[in-house]
């Protein structure tokens, strides 16, 4: 048993980092793997991962961390058995993607104007809670060239647009994602989209 | 919000031991290791030494080794911080710091005043 | 064990400009990150700054932290006389032993 590719690992900064490998045949990750992880750290206790399958001969780990701040470093040990298959580390703040943003909502009672709101993903005291930037993803469910990306690079997490830059009359859906520059981090995975049908009075022309 | 609640002022003897308990709140208390750190009248901060609440280990400044032991109450997220053979240079407001390589939150320390 | 050597006092008028230093060793500070406390009178400390640069929510952008090689510097622009307090720098050391050596503070004077 080998490894073809080795792990590779991102971080949420916050609890759960995932590292995905691939063995060079059909495995069954859960009872023939473990991957063990322990943070260099005085008083760090070693932590153990079962993995996941991930296709035929993927696997995949969450690792569960506490605390995660920009000095941590992990030894990662992936065992099968006895016989030791790979060893390396891992630096959480140097391979993060977000949490996704959550509960993205869309205010039309606002006089022509649309507001949509969505929640940062992060508690206060995280880092990342004041560095998030967002991309919101609008498009009509009708007419696929209708697709449009809007760049949020203030910290609050809402967006306003005019409802007259939509087609009237038809369905809309929106999702959002957010990254962080500070640690030049990947991009989230998309929020759930949400739906919502535009209309809006033309205005009376003279 | 994060709050570490510390024990009273106390007065002892040299010799004495004393006994400064540190309760946690409004956070997941196995998973932020706890500093103690003292403070003489006047002077500056002193680092005492670390414990990792989740399985209690504990790491302690050199100065202080055979004379601090540091413990915990997972049952009511409580560390406590001992320190035996007290002499007068030992009177110290006396702070638990949660944190792992800075300390994020304080609590307000306790006076321990020793004196015969 | 480590030791960070800050000056003893610094002053500055209100809305001025102020930087406190904290010198080490390759030990302590040239090999892990920089975090300065601020100590009202008769309170305890709070962390102004970590990771050398960050700030916990809640600390005005007046106060910036930087590194550079074994010393480290705390900024504080628009000084106000809030800001009057003793400022300690910290950091950690994994040799010989691990420690956490505090900086020998400063105490800041808004005249």
């Known amino acids: 048993m080998k490894v073809l590719q080795e792990p590779t690992c991102v971080s949420d900064y916050m609890s759960i980092s995932t590292c995905e490998w691939k063995m060079n045949g059909p495995t069954n990750c859960s009872t023939e793997l473990r991957l063990l992880y322990q943070l260099v750290f005085l008083l760090s206790e070693a932590h153990t991962c079962i993995p996941e399958n991930n296709g035929g001969a993927g696997c995949v780990c969450h690792l569960l961390m506490d605390d995660v701040v920009s000095a941590d470093n992990y030894t990662l040990d992936l065992w099968a058995g006895q016989q030791l298959l790979w060893k390396g580390s891992f630096k959480p703040s140097e391979h993060v993607k977000p949490r996704a943003p959550g509960n993205l909502t869309v205010h039309t009672n606002v006089s022509d104007t649309l507001l949509l709101t969505w929640s940062n993903p992060y508690p206060p005291d995280n880092y990342l809670y004041n560095h998030l930037t967002y991309a919101v993803n609008i498009w009509s469910e009708n007419d696929p060239a209708d697709f449009r990306i809007y760049n949020v690079t203030y910290l609050e997490p809402s967006l306003r647009i005019a409802a007259s830059t939509l087609k009237s009359g038809i369905s809309y859906r929106a999702r959002v994602r957010a990254w962080a520059q500070c640690y030049n981090t990947t991009w989230s995975e998309w929020s759930p989209s949400t739906k919502w049908h535009n209309s809006y009075r033309e205005p009376f022309e003279q | 919000q994060v709050q570490l609640v510390q024990s009273g002022a106390e007065v002892k003897k040299p010799g004495a031991s004393v006994k400064v308990s540190c309760k946690a709140s409004g956070y997941a208390f196995t998973s932020y290791y706890m500093h103690w750190a003292r403070q003489a009248p006047g002077q500056g901060l002193e680092w005492m030494g670390i414990?990792?609440?989740?399985?209690?280990?504990?790491s302690y400044a050199q100065k202080f080794q055979g004379r601090v032991t540091m413990t915990r109450d997972t049952s009511t997220s409580t560390v406590y911080m001992e320190l035996s053979s007290l002499r007068s240079e030992d009177t110290a407001v006396y702070y638990c710091?949660?944190?792992?390589?800075?300390?994020?939150?304080w609590g307000k320390g306790t006076l321990v005043t020793v004196s015969s | 064990q480590s030791v960070l050597t800050q000056p003893p006092s610094v002053s500055a008028a209100p809305g001025q400009k102020v930087t406190i230093s904290c010198s080490g060793g390759s030990s302590s500070i040239g090999n892990s990150y920089v975090s300065w406390y601020q100590q009202l009178p008769g309170t305890a400390p709070k962390l102004l700054i970590y990771d050398n640069n960050k700030r916990p929510s809640g600390i005005p952008d007046r106060f910036s932290g930087s590194k550079s090689g074994t010393s480290a510097t705390l900024a504080i622009t628009g000084l106000q006389t809030g800001d009057e307090a003793d400022y300690y720098c910290?950091?950690?050391?994994?040799?010989?032993?691990?420690?956490?050596?505090f900086g020998t503070g400063t105490k800041l004077t808004v005249l």
């Open positions: 910290g950091t950690w050391a994994t040799s010989p032993v691990w420690e956490w050596p």
């Open positions: 710091a949660r944190g792992k390589y800075w300390m994020y939150d």
């Open positions: 414990i990792n609440p989740s399985g209690g280990s504990t």
